[in-house]
């Protein structure tokens, strides 16, 4: 099904965004103290395999971060530990708990050199800037056709209140500095750039500070000009994948075409015993196939309670009148061994569709691969 | 300079069809979206759809959906809003605006602003 | 949809007054709001995109500001040209939607 222009997907790194979380957890901790964050699974049942994050990277273990599937201790923290802590399914990528941290010490006398953050002080404790929605910030990725608008924002709080500024590619950035000029909305932390032209491509970099810390976040701005091209795929997504035997795993495809794409999710299979046909061709499955009106596409394919069977190689493959465009990514499922699971059959929302998948010819697709139907999988399979 | 013109209108009897033109000219008519606003006689504003012409996109309000088509030639640069089975409550001024996104990664949506718009033309449809 | 009330339906003034428009939604439409002004057997003219940033060539006197559901659109020092109707018009749900309009009138 198309997704329309009204809604407007962009890339989110590997993200499948779930349920909102409950609200966030405001956590103050003092300079040298121990932050400990916990993440009990939801419900109280099992958690899988987490990953924590902090303002959208991910945390590396060391002898003073200490990383556990429901709990993060930073030991000794200091000002730089400040920021959007986050506790995640490390498959899906789902926000499970998050919480904004502020380390601080209560400033000594005489601290304010110019005196002119007092009268900012609202006499919370003093702490160094944060994202105030961090769930919001993991997006880095956008692509807009030329002439559209650009805005981006880096809402963040902070006592005293920080000020933001703009880099473009790492430089200062200006009005000045582009035909048309910039909007800046410093209450609303936002920049502004309106009929963007392909010279306007680069990375837009916020930073927010105050005296007590930085934080930054960095977009990349991609500039689409009209002219016919074959689709485009957006780097990095899908990503390969490693799954839990009897878990539901999600992958994401962003496809931008100006033209009408096809886009399909296909697998690659084997025919008796072999996985390539006689003239040397893959031989795949088309899992989920469809036109999509939209100027730009995030599709997904949702595969539930994956057996041993799902793992391999998958294609996400858009195609309009000037050419084809493919990513290839591999699924791994491991686990204690299961019994033996039919195919994945589809469910209600039509993820996987099996069996009556109408087949489009290899001169349609340009005879990369062979394309079998899941009937023919399931008489290959027992026989 | 940024130019719009509707043609097209008249009158038209219940259940009849008409087709109306918007040709574009001073600016890149690939670029941005054409959007169709109606307003009937003493009353406000009311968003009828829109097209992207380079991808053929569209989206429609329910009150027309499945009775009104919009379409774009891009090598006229022109958009096209085909009405089909015409009711007296569609009589109104249509107008057609230059149709511009506001891409945010911070939000969910596009939001979509009309910056140039046409003179308008009028259909009645009456018996 | 969502529904946009404008008030007041209608208001008099005189040169140089600062008139204040409201609008309000009927859910959260963030900064996604623009103002139009309608002069009679006219087009619509855009005046205020994003909730408050002018668009060009729009004389600064226009300003807008609010997010979430309530905006407002000011005119610091009304002059002639200025009588007209407003709109205010979301676009984060489809379908767009359009207040029912505020006729500024003379005194």
């Known amino acids: 099904e198309s997704l329309g222009t009204e809604q407007r997907v962009v890339g989110r790194a590997a993200e499948v965004p779930g349920p909102e979380p409950g609200q966030q957890e405001q956590l103050v901790f003092g300079s040298g103290d121990a932050v400990e964050l916990s993440c009990p699974p939801p419900g109280g049942g099992p958690m899988g395999p987490t990953v924590w994050v902090k303002d959208g990277t991910g945390l590396v273990p060391s002898e003073r971060v200490l990383v556990g599937p429901q709990r993060l201790q930073v030991l000794n923290a200091s000002h730089e530990d400040s920021g959007a802590y986050s506790c995640r399914q490390r498959l899906t990528q789902r926000v499970l708990c998050h919480f904004s941290v502020r380390v601080t010490d209560a400033p000594s006398s005489g601290d304010d050199e110019d005196g002119e953050d007092e009268a900012e002080d609202t006499g919370v404790d003093t702490g160094a800037p944060y994202w105030t929605r961090p769930e919001r910030m993991d997006k880095k990725l956008l692509a807009v056709p030329a002439a559209n608008t650009v805005r981006f924002r880096c809402p963040a709080a902070g006592n005293p209140t920080p000020s933001i500024s703009w880099l473009k590619n790492g430089r200062e950035f200006r009005g000045e500095h582009r035909i048309g000029g910039i909007k800046l909305r410093h209450q609303q932390w936002s920049l502004v750039m309106e009929s963007v032209v392909p010279s306007d491509r680069g990375n837009y970099t916020c930073v927010v500070e105050n005296k007590f810390g930085s934080i930054r976040q960095t977009y990349t701005l991609d500039v689409l000009e009209r002219s016919p091209h074959r689709p485009i795929l957006q780097a990095g997504l899908p990503a390969n994948q490693t799954a839990v035997l009897g878990s539901d795993v999600e992958f994401h495809c962003k496809v931008y075409s100006d033209a009408q794409p096809h886009i399909q999710w296909l697998k690659h299979v084997e025919v008796n015993g072999s996985k390539v046909g006689p003239d040397g061709t893959p031989y795949v499955t088309v899992l989920k196939s469809w036109i999509s009106e939209s100027v730009e596409a995030d599709v997904r394919l949702r595969l539930a309670n994956v057996s041993e069977r799902d793992g391999g190689e998958y294609l996400c493959r858009a195609t309009n009148f000037i050419g084809v465009a493919e990513k290839a990514f591999w699924l791994s499922v491991h686990g204690p061994r299961a019994a033996e699971e039919e195919l994945v059959e589809a469910d209600e929302a039509g993820s996987v569709y099996a069996g009556e998948q109408k087949l489009i010819s290899e001169e349609d697709l340009g005879g990369e691969q062979k394309l079998i139907s899941e009937e023919d999988l399931h008489h290959h399979h027992h026989h | 300079e940024v130019q719009l013109v509707e043609s097209g209108g008249g009158l038209v009897q219940p259940g009849g069809s008409l087709r109306l033109s918007c040709a574009a000219s001073g600016f890149t008519f690939t670029s941005t979206g054409i959007s169709w606003v109606r307003q009937a006689p003493g009353k406000g504003l009311e968003w009828v759809g829109r097209?992207?012409?380079?991808?053929?996109?569209?989206n429609y309000a329910d009150s027309v959906k499945g009775r009104f088509t919009i379409s774009a030639d891009t090598s006229k640069n022109t958009a096209y809003l085909q009405m089909n089975s015409l009711r007296a409550e569609d009589t109104a001024v249509y107008y057609c605006a230059r149709t511009y996104g506001i891409y945010d990664l911070y939000v969910d949506y596009t939001e979509y602003v009309m910056d140039y718009w046409g003179q308008g033309t009028l259909v009645t449809v009456s018996s | 949809d969502i529904q946009m009330t404008q008030s007041p339906s209608s208001l008099s003034a005189s040169v140089g007054d600062r008139v204040t428009i409201t609008c309000r939604a009927s859910?959260?439409?963030?900064?996604?709001l623009a103002w139009y002004k309608q002069k009679p057997g006219k087009a619509p003219k855009l005046l205020i995109y994003?909730?408050?940033f002018l668009y060009s060539g729009v004389p600064s006197r226009f300003s807008g500001s609010g997010s979430g559901t309530d905006f407002t659109l000011t005119i610091s020092s009304l002059q002639p040209e200025d009588f007209a109707t407003y709109y205010c018009q979301q676009s984060t749900g489809h379908p767009q939607t359009f207040g029912q309009g505020t006729k500024v009138e003379i005194k």
């Open positions: 097209i992207y012409p380079t991808s053929g996109s569209t």
């Open positions: 994003s909730a408050s």
């Open positions: 859910q959260d439409v963030d900064t996604s």
